[in-house]
Amino acid sequence: AGSDSLYVPCAPSPCVNGGTCRQTGDFTFECNCLPGFEGSTCERNIDDCPNHRCQNGGVCVDGVNTYNCRCPPQWTGQFCTEDVDECLLQPNACQNGGTCANRNGGYGCVCVNGWSGDDCSENIDDCAFASCTPGSTCIDRVASFSCMCPEGKAGLLCHLDDACISNPCHKGALCDTNPLNGQYICTCPQGYKGADCTEDVDEGNSHHHHHH
């Protein structure tokens, strides 16, 4: 004759996640849950994240009876309240000789003359503030600019008339313009001297420079 199987509430234990079963009646039981779990069989992990302590935009990640903070890259520590020193982590954070300065929640670059941008990678367009004479072409350089003059103009800003236009140098001499004052400079061929290379040279000197 078969015997009815006897129901024992705690055998096997219905409590999960390490909960301890206690029989409370013939057909009833109670689970004593480990910290961090709840429910009649301890099946639910309690969410520890409500009103969490992760700061500076840290994201709460629930654990068992605890939580972790996932921090933005510029913060670290248990609650994302420790500043990351980006200048140590990224030695080349600032380019072109810029100096890295760590700040709370980030960093900044102090750029050398002629460079700008968050990482000092942008060459400042010096032509934006240049005063090359209209008609000339501005060429941007690092922390400076130069003006390319049209024919007939001279000087650093192309604001002077080119004295060489009138061919003041004679006898095949080379004519250059002084960029500061616009005056011509004649480089005389062998045998000639003078401001415009019109004088004969008695002694055997080679080239003579004359400014005018």
Epitope: V64, T66, N68, Q78, F79, T81
Partner: antibody, heavy 117, light 112 residues
Framework: EVQLVQSGAEVKKPGESLKISCKGS????????IHWVRQMPGKGPEWTGY????????KFNEKFKGQATISVDKSSTTAYLQWSSLKASDTAMYYC??????????WGQGTLVTVSS | DIVMTQSPDSLAVSLGERATINCRSS???????????LHWYQQKPGQPPKLLIY???NRFSGVPDRFSGSGSGTDFTLTISSLQAEDVAVYYC?????????FGGGTKVEIK
């Protein structure tokens, strides 16, 4: 420079209400929780609870739940600790604090609350 | 709550001598993230506590190197290698691994 400046000392009678303040400056106020820490005469500090300025959410030490409330005014970057009915056992120094490298890295100067009939 | 037990309650040390303070927790302070959130504070009369050491052994900015921290799990030590007159204070350990944060009872350091 991070600074937490608290309101002055208070002497109250049992049953009276009280609101003490903590003004934060030198940092982004809404990015950090403000803690309140109690220190009874001759004893060690005890963490009471904190408020999240951004949301106004609070978390308390179970030991202090229901005894006081914590609030915040973001516009004036000020946190408050308030009692509706003081008891003699509330006599203590109350500090506000902010996290940094460790828990409670930056502290206010403290507010002494004396409750006596 | 985690109970933090400090010893001794008070300590008298000669100037220039070593002072050692112990702190024991009722449970391991190793967090699930692998770090141990045990910190040390100094409190002088009429002042708020001041952070000295965070996460067992990291000196907070401006803290003299005569202060050092060590330990693991449940047992931790704060050492003042050469006591100075300005070190007279009460020292507290604090754990923030488990909710809620709990302080030790304090150790009073005096000059012998």
């Amino acid at each position: 420079e991070v600074q937490l400046v608290q309101s002055g000392a208070e002497v109250k009678k049992p049953g009276e209400s009280l609101k003490i303040s903590c003004k934060g400056s030198g940092y982004t106020f809404s990015n950090y929780v403000i803690h309140w820490v109690r220190q009874m005469p001759g004893k060690g500090p005890e963490w009471t609870g904190y408020i999240i300025p951004g949301s106004g959410g609070t978390k308390f030490n179970e030991k202090f739940k229901g005894q006081a409330t914590i609030s915040v005014d973001k516009s004036s970057t000020t946190a408050y600790l308030q009692w509706s009915s003081l008891k003699a056992s509330d006599t203590a120094m109350y500090y506000c604090a902010r996290d940094g490298a460790g828990s409670f890295t930056y502290w206010g100067q403290g507010t002494l609350v004396t409750v006596s009939s | 709550d985690i109970v933090m037990t400090q010893s001794p309650d008070s300590l008298a040390v000669s100037l220039g001598e070593r002072a050692t303070i112990n702190c024991r927790s009722s449970q391991s302070l190793v967090h699930s993230d692998g770090n141990t959130y045990l910190h040390w504070y100094q409190q002088k009369p009429g002042q708020p506590p001041k952070l000295l050491i965070y996460r067992i052994s990291n000196r907070f900015s401006g803290v003299p190197d005569r202060f050092s921290g060590s330990g693991s799990g449940t047992d931790f030590t704060l050492t003042i290698s050469s006591l100075q007159a300005e070190d007279v204070a009460v020292y507290y350990c604090l754990q923030s691994t488990h909710f809620p944060d709990t302080f030790g009872g304090g150790t009073k350091v005096e000059i012998k």
